[in-house]
Protein backbone atom coordinates (compact mmCIF):
# COMPACT_ATOMS: atom_id res chain seq x y z
CA UNK A 1 0.00 0.00 0.00
CA UNK A 2 0.97 3.68 -0.07
CA UNK A 3 2.48 3.50 3.42
CA UNK A 4 5.09 1.07 2.04
CA UNK A 5 5.78 3.51 -0.79
CA UNK A 6 6.51 6.24 1.77
CA UNK A 7 8.83 3.94 3.72
CA UNK A 8 10.70 3.17 0.47
CA UNK A 9 11.02 6.91 -0.19
CA UNK A 10 12.43 7.45 3.30
CA UNK A 11 14.89 4.61 2.65
CA UNK A 12 15.99 6.21 -0.64
CA UNK A 13 16.39 9.55 1.15
CA UNK A 14 18.62 7.94 3.78
CA UNK A 15 20.67 6.10 1.16
CA UNK A 16 21.36 9.13 -1.02
CA UNK A 17 22.44 11.27 1.94
CA UNK A 18 25.64 9.20 2.05
CA UNK A 19 26.23 9.80 -1.66
CA UNK A 20 26.95 12.91 -3.66
CA UNK A 21 24.33 13.01 -6.38
CA UNK A 22 23.80 16.57 -7.55
CA UNK A 23 21.17 15.81 -10.20
CA UNK A 24 18.19 18.09 -10.63
CA UNK A 25 14.89 16.36 -11.24
CA UNK A 26 11.55 17.36 -12.76
CA UNK A 27 9.39 17.98 -9.72
CA UNK A 28 5.66 18.68 -9.38
CA UNK A 29 5.42 20.65 -6.16
CA UNK A 30 1.82 21.83 -6.55
CA UNK A 31 -0.18 18.82 -7.69
CA UNK A 32 -3.75 19.38 -8.77
CA UNK A 33 -5.92 16.41 -7.61
CA UNK A 34 -7.11 15.84 -11.19
CA UNK A 35 -3.50 15.38 -12.33
CA UNK A 36 -2.11 13.25 -9.51
CA UNK A 37 -1.63 10.05 -11.57
CA UNK A 38 0.24 12.00 -14.27
CA UNK A 39 2.38 13.61 -11.58
CA UNK A 40 3.03 10.17 -10.03
CA UNK A 41 4.24 8.92 -13.42
CA UNK A 42 6.72 11.82 -13.62
CA UNK A 43 8.00 11.15 -10.12
CA UNK A 44 8.53 7.46 -10.90
CA UNK A 45 10.33 8.18 -14.16
CA UNK A 46 12.63 10.62 -12.38
CA UNK A 47 13.26 8.06 -9.62
CA UNK A 48 14.75 5.84 -12.30
CA UNK A 49 17.21 8.66 -13.06
CA UNK A 50 18.30 8.60 -9.39
CA UNK A 51 18.75 4.83 -9.62
CA UNK A 52 20.87 5.12 -12.76
CA UNK A 53 23.02 7.94 -11.39
CA UNK A 54 23.67 6.28 -8.05
CA UNK A 55 24.80 2.91 -9.42
CA UNK A 56 23.85 1.59 -5.97
CA UNK A 57 22.19 -1.82 -5.54
CA UNK A 58 20.10 -0.78 -2.52
CA UNK A 59 18.77 2.32 -4.29
CA UNK A 60 18.15 0.34 -7.48
CA UNK A 61 16.20 -2.38 -5.62
CA UNK A 62 14.21 0.12 -3.58
CA UNK A 63 13.26 2.16 -6.66
CA UNK A 64 12.12 -1.01 -8.46
CA UNK A 65 10.10 -2.10 -5.44
CA UNK A 66 8.50 1.32 -5.18
CA UNK A 67 7.48 1.22 -8.85
CA UNK A 68 6.08 -2.32 -8.45
CA UNK A 69 4.03 -1.18 -5.42
CA UNK A 70 2.72 1.94 -7.15
CA UNK A 71 1.86 -0.02 -10.29
CA UNK A 72 -0.15 -2.58 -8.37
CA UNK A 73 -2.02 0.00 -6.28
CA UNK A 74 -2.92 2.12 -9.28
CA UNK A 75 -3.87 -0.86 -11.48
CA UNK A 76 -6.40 -1.96 -8.87
CA UNK A 77 -8.17 1.39 -9.38
CA UNK A 78 -8.63 0.63 -13.08
CA UNK A 79 -7.48 2.79 -15.98
CA UNK A 80 -7.42 6.45 -14.97
CA UNK A 81 -7.14 8.93 -17.83
CA UNK A 82 -6.22 12.52 -17.07
CA UNK A 83 -6.12 15.41 -19.50
CA UNK A 84 -4.75 18.95 -19.43
CA UNK A 85 -1.87 17.97 -17.16
CA UNK A 86 1.73 19.17 -17.48
CA UNK A 87 4.26 16.99 -19.30
CA UNK A 88 7.16 15.89 -17.08
CA UNK A 89 9.57 18.12 -19.03
CA UNK A 90 7.42 21.18 -18.26
CA UNK A 91 7.92 20.76 -14.52
CA UNK A 92 10.37 22.74 -12.44
CA UNK A 93 13.78 21.18 -11.85
CA UNK A 94 14.65 20.75 -8.20
CA UNK A 95 17.33 19.05 -6.15
CA UNK A 96 16.89 15.49 -4.86
CA UNK A 97 15.91 16.53 -1.34
CA UNK A 98 13.09 18.78 -2.58
CA UNK A 99 12.08 16.16 -5.15
CA UNK A 100 11.67 13.47 -2.48
CA UNK A 101 9.75 15.83 -0.18
CA UNK A 102 7.32 16.59 -3.01
CA UNK A 103 7.05 12.88 -3.79
CA UNK A 104 6.05 12.12 -0.19
CA UNK A 105 3.48 14.92 -0.43
CA UNK A 106 1.82 13.42 -3.52
CA UNK A 107 1.76 9.94 -1.95
CA UNK A 108 0.00 11.45 1.07
CA UNK A 109 -2.52 12.94 -1.35
CA UNK A 110 -3.23 9.40 -2.64
CA UNK A 111 -3.54 8.12 0.94
CA UNK A 112 -6.02 10.87 1.84
CA UNK A 113 -8.25 10.09 -1.16
CA UNK A 114 -8.18 6.29 -0.88
Amino acid sequence: NWVNVISDLKKIEDLIQSMHIDATLYTESDVHPSCKVTAMKCFLLELQVISHESGDTDIHDTVENLIILANNILSSNGNITESGCKECEELEEKNIKEFLQSFVHIVQMFINTS
Partner: antibody, heavy 122, light 112 residues
Protein backbone atom coordinates in the same frame (compact mmCIF):
# COMPACT_ATOMS: atom_id res chain seq x y z
CA UNK B 1 28.11 -18.24 -21.43
CA UNK B 2 25.64 -17.64 -18.58
CA UNK B 3 25.01 -20.81 -16.59
CA UNK B 4 22.25 -21.61 -14.10
CA UNK B 5 22.19 -25.07 -12.53
CA UNK B 6 19.31 -26.13 -10.27
CA UNK B 7 19.56 -28.90 -7.67
CA UNK B 8 17.70 -30.21 -4.63
CA UNK B 9 14.64 -31.68 -6.29
CA UNK B 10 13.28 -35.08 -5.38
CA UNK B 11 10.39 -37.00 -3.87
CA UNK B 12 8.76 -35.54 -0.76
CA UNK B 13 5.60 -36.39 1.17
CA UNK B 14 2.66 -33.97 1.36
CA UNK B 15 3.26 -31.50 4.20
CA UNK B 16 7.01 -31.94 3.86
CA UNK B 17 9.76 -29.46 3.01
CA UNK B 18 12.46 -29.15 0.39
CA UNK B 19 15.11 -26.57 -0.45
CA UNK B 20 16.09 -25.98 -4.04
CA UNK B 21 19.36 -24.33 -5.05
CA UNK B 22 20.43 -22.62 -8.24
CA UNK B 23 24.16 -22.13 -8.81
CA UNK B 24 24.96 -19.21 -11.11
CA UNK B 25 28.15 -18.67 -13.07
CA UNK B 26 29.68 -16.65 -15.92
CA UNK B 27 27.95 -13.40 -14.90
CA UNK B 28 27.93 -10.99 -11.97
CA UNK B 29 25.17 -12.61 -9.91
CA UNK B 30 24.62 -9.64 -7.58
CA UNK B 31 23.72 -7.41 -10.56
CA UNK B 32 20.55 -9.32 -11.35
CA UNK B 33 17.19 -10.01 -9.80
CA UNK B 34 16.32 -13.72 -10.00
CA UNK B 35 13.13 -15.74 -10.35
CA UNK B 36 11.73 -19.25 -9.94
CA UNK B 37 9.21 -20.57 -12.46
CA UNK B 38 7.60 -24.01 -12.34
CA UNK B 39 5.94 -26.37 -14.79
CA UNK B 40 3.66 -29.19 -13.69
CA UNK B 41 3.93 -32.37 -15.81
CA UNK B 42 2.30 -31.76 -19.21
CA UNK B 43 1.16 -28.27 -18.16
CA UNK B 44 2.14 -24.65 -18.76
CA UNK B 45 4.54 -22.32 -16.97
CA UNK B 46 3.74 -20.65 -13.64
CA UNK B 47 5.72 -17.85 -12.01
CA UNK B 48 6.64 -18.79 -8.43
CA UNK B 49 8.89 -16.09 -6.94
CA UNK B 50 11.23 -13.19 -7.65
CA UNK B 51 13.95 -11.65 -5.51
CA UNK B 52 15.72 -8.31 -5.91
CA UNK B 53 19.45 -7.97 -6.57
CA UNK B 54 20.35 -7.37 -2.95
CA UNK B 55 17.74 -9.79 -1.58
CA UNK B 56 15.70 -7.24 0.39
CA UNK B 57 12.57 -7.50 -1.76
CA UNK B 58 10.66 -10.66 -2.63
CA UNK B 59 7.49 -11.24 -4.65
CA UNK B 60 5.15 -14.26 -4.80
CA UNK B 61 1.78 -15.30 -6.23
CA UNK B 62 -0.94 -16.22 -3.71
CA UNK B 63 -0.56 -19.91 -4.59
CA UNK B 64 2.79 -20.14 -2.75
CA UNK B 65 2.79 -17.07 -0.48
CA UNK B 66 3.46 -18.06 3.14
CA UNK B 67 4.74 -21.51 2.14
CA UNK B 68 7.68 -20.75 -0.16
CA UNK B 69 10.61 -18.44 0.53
CA UNK B 70 13.04 -17.21 -2.11
CA UNK B 71 16.47 -16.12 -0.91
CA UNK B 72 19.98 -15.64 -2.24
CA UNK B 73 23.60 -15.66 -1.14
CA UNK B 74 25.49 -13.26 -3.38
CA UNK B 75 28.83 -14.33 -1.91
CA UNK B 76 28.13 -17.89 -3.11
CA UNK B 77 26.40 -16.91 -6.38
CA UNK B 78 23.47 -19.06 -5.33
CA UNK B 79 19.69 -18.67 -5.39
CA UNK B 80 17.42 -20.71 -3.11
CA UNK B 81 13.78 -21.71 -2.85
CA UNK B 82 12.66 -23.02 0.53
CA UNK B 83 9.39 -24.93 0.06
CA UNK B 84 7.32 -25.83 3.13
CA UNK B 85 3.88 -27.42 3.60
CA UNK B 86 4.20 -29.03 0.20
CA UNK B 87 1.07 -30.21 -1.64
CA UNK B 88 0.50 -32.62 -4.53
CA UNK B 89 -0.19 -29.62 -6.79
CA UNK B 90 3.36 -28.35 -6.16
CA UNK B 91 4.67 -31.29 -8.20
CA UNK B 92 6.58 -29.70 -11.10
CA UNK B 93 9.89 -29.00 -12.73
CA UNK B 94 11.29 -25.88 -11.05
CA UNK B 95 13.41 -23.52 -13.16
CA UNK B 96 15.52 -20.66 -11.95
CA UNK B 97 15.88 -17.71 -14.30
CA UNK B 98 17.96 -14.54 -14.44
CA UNK B 99 15.89 -11.40 -14.57
CA UNK B 100 16.86 -8.28 -16.48
CA UNK B 101 16.20 -5.10 -14.50
CA UNK B 102 13.22 -2.87 -15.20
CA UNK B 103 15.49 0.14 -14.95
CA UNK B 104 18.24 -1.07 -17.26
CA UNK B 105 16.32 -3.10 -19.82
CA UNK B 106 12.71 -3.80 -18.99
CA UNK B 107 11.81 -6.90 -17.07
CA UNK B 108 12.57 -10.18 -18.82
CA UNK B 109 13.88 -13.60 -17.80
CA UNK B 110 16.75 -13.83 -20.25
CA UNK B 111 18.51 -17.03 -19.14
CA UNK B 112 17.04 -20.20 -17.62
CA UNK B 113 18.43 -23.28 -15.91
CA UNK B 114 17.64 -26.83 -17.01
CA UNK B 115 15.18 -27.35 -14.13
CA UNK B 116 14.89 -29.75 -11.21
CA UNK B 117 11.91 -32.07 -10.65
CA UNK B 118 9.98 -31.91 -7.37
CA UNK B 119 7.46 -34.70 -6.78
CA UNK B 120 5.04 -34.41 -3.86
CA UNK B 121 3.42 -37.77 -3.21
CA UNK B 122 2.74 -40.21 -0.41
CA UNK C 1 -4.85 -10.85 -11.20
CA UNK C 2 -4.11 -10.26 -14.88
CA UNK C 3 -5.28 -13.25 -16.93
CA UNK C 4 -3.38 -13.89 -20.17
CA UNK C 5 -5.34 -15.76 -22.84
CA UNK C 6 -3.59 -17.22 -25.87
CA UNK C 7 -5.07 -18.41 -29.14
CA UNK C 8 -4.95 -20.76 -30.83
CA UNK C 9 -3.83 -23.38 -28.31
CA UNK C 10 -2.68 -25.61 -31.16
CA UNK C 11 -1.15 -24.33 -34.39
CA UNK C 12 -0.32 -26.74 -37.22
CA UNK C 13 1.82 -24.94 -39.84
CA UNK C 14 3.44 -25.93 -43.12
CA UNK C 15 7.21 -25.43 -43.27
CA UNK C 16 8.08 -22.09 -44.83
CA UNK C 17 4.64 -20.64 -44.13
CA UNK C 18 3.90 -17.81 -41.65
CA UNK C 19 2.42 -18.36 -38.20
CA UNK C 20 0.70 -16.00 -35.81
CA UNK C 21 -0.13 -16.38 -32.11
CA UNK C 22 -2.46 -14.03 -30.25
CA UNK C 23 -2.27 -13.10 -26.56
CA UNK C 24 -4.93 -11.05 -24.76
CA UNK C 25 -4.68 -9.65 -21.25
CA UNK C 26 -7.74 -9.22 -19.02
CA UNK C 27 -6.74 -5.60 -18.38
CA UNK C 28 -4.26 -3.14 -19.86
CA UNK C 29 -0.69 -4.08 -18.99
CA UNK C 30 0.71 -0.61 -19.62
CA UNK C 31 2.35 0.32 -16.33
CA UNK C 32 2.37 3.71 -14.59
CA UNK C 33 5.62 4.72 -16.32
CA UNK C 34 4.13 3.96 -19.73
CA UNK C 35 6.01 0.70 -20.27
CA UNK C 36 4.40 -2.56 -21.36
CA UNK C 37 6.22 -5.55 -19.92
CA UNK C 38 5.05 -8.31 -22.24
CA UNK C 39 7.39 -11.13 -23.22
CA UNK C 40 7.25 -14.20 -25.44
CA UNK C 41 9.03 -17.41 -24.51
CA UNK C 42 9.65 -20.50 -26.62
CA UNK C 43 9.92 -23.98 -25.13
CA UNK C 44 11.17 -26.65 -27.49
CA UNK C 45 10.32 -30.29 -26.63
CA UNK C 46 12.36 -31.47 -23.63
CA UNK C 47 14.08 -28.10 -23.20
CA UNK C 48 13.92 -25.12 -20.84
CA UNK C 49 12.03 -21.99 -21.89
CA UNK C 50 13.94 -19.42 -23.93
CA UNK C 51 13.32 -15.68 -24.19
CA UNK C 52 12.33 -14.53 -27.69
CA UNK C 53 10.75 -11.08 -27.30
CA UNK C 54 10.66 -8.54 -24.46
CA UNK C 55 8.73 -5.29 -23.99
CA UNK C 56 6.26 -6.30 -26.73
CA UNK C 57 8.51 -6.06 -29.79
CA UNK C 58 12.21 -6.20 -28.81
CA UNK C 59 13.98 -9.32 -30.06
CA UNK C 60 16.39 -10.88 -27.58
CA UNK C 61 19.98 -11.35 -28.77
CA UNK C 62 20.46 -14.37 -30.99
CA UNK C 63 16.76 -14.67 -31.85
CA UNK C 64 16.25 -14.97 -35.63
CA UNK C 65 14.58 -12.00 -37.30
CA UNK C 66 11.74 -14.19 -38.57
CA UNK C 67 10.28 -13.74 -35.05
CA UNK C 68 8.51 -10.45 -34.38
CA UNK C 69 6.25 -9.11 -31.66
CA UNK C 70 3.58 -6.42 -31.83
CA UNK C 71 0.55 -5.06 -30.01
CA UNK C 72 -0.44 -2.65 -27.26
CA UNK C 73 -2.76 -2.30 -24.28
CA UNK C 74 -4.43 -5.70 -24.06
CA UNK C 75 -3.79 -7.29 -27.49
CA UNK C 76 -0.46 -8.76 -28.49
CA UNK C 77 0.82 -10.94 -31.32
CA UNK C 78 3.86 -13.10 -31.99
CA UNK C 79 4.54 -13.68 -35.69
CA UNK C 80 6.92 -16.10 -37.36
CA UNK C 81 7.42 -15.03 -40.98
CA UNK C 82 8.53 -18.44 -42.28
CA UNK C 83 8.28 -21.44 -39.97
CA UNK C 84 11.32 -23.73 -39.75
CA UNK C 85 11.54 -27.23 -38.25
CA UNK C 86 13.42 -25.92 -35.20
CA UNK C 87 10.45 -23.66 -34.32
CA UNK C 88 8.38 -26.63 -33.12
CA UNK C 89 7.44 -26.26 -29.46
CA UNK C 90 5.19 -24.33 -27.10
CA UNK C 91 5.06 -20.52 -27.08
CA UNK C 92 4.05 -18.56 -23.99
CA UNK C 93 3.23 -14.90 -23.52
CA UNK C 94 4.01 -13.44 -20.10
CA UNK C 95 3.20 -10.17 -18.37
CA UNK C 96 5.33 -8.71 -15.63
CA UNK C 97 3.82 -5.26 -15.46
CA UNK C 98 1.79 -6.23 -12.39
CA UNK C 99 2.29 -8.69 -9.53
CA UNK C 100 1.40 -11.55 -9.66
CA UNK C 101 3.20 -12.04 -12.96
CA UNK C 102 1.25 -14.34 -15.25
CA UNK C 103 1.80 -16.58 -18.27
CA UNK C 104 -0.62 -17.45 -21.03
CA UNK C 105 -1.65 -21.13 -21.31
CA UNK C 106 0.75 -21.75 -24.17
CA UNK C 107 0.35 -22.37 -27.89
CA UNK C 108 1.71 -25.61 -29.33
CA UNK C 109 3.23 -25.10 -32.77
CA UNK C 110 3.62 -28.24 -34.85
CA UNK C 111 4.51 -28.99 -38.46
CA UNK C 112 1.67 -30.14 -40.74
Amino acid sequence: EVQLVESGGGLVQPGGSLRLSCAASEFTFSNYAMSWVRQAPGKGLEWVATISRGGDYTYYPDSVKGRFTISRDNSKNTLYLQMNSLRAEDTAVYYCARRVSMITGGWAMDYWGQGTLVTVSS
Amino acid sequence: DVVMTQSPLSLPVTLGQPASISCRSSQSIVDITGNTYLEWYQQRPGQSPRLLIYKVFNRFSGVPDRFSGSGSGTDFTLKISRVEAEDVGVYYCFQDSFVPYTFGQGTKLEIK
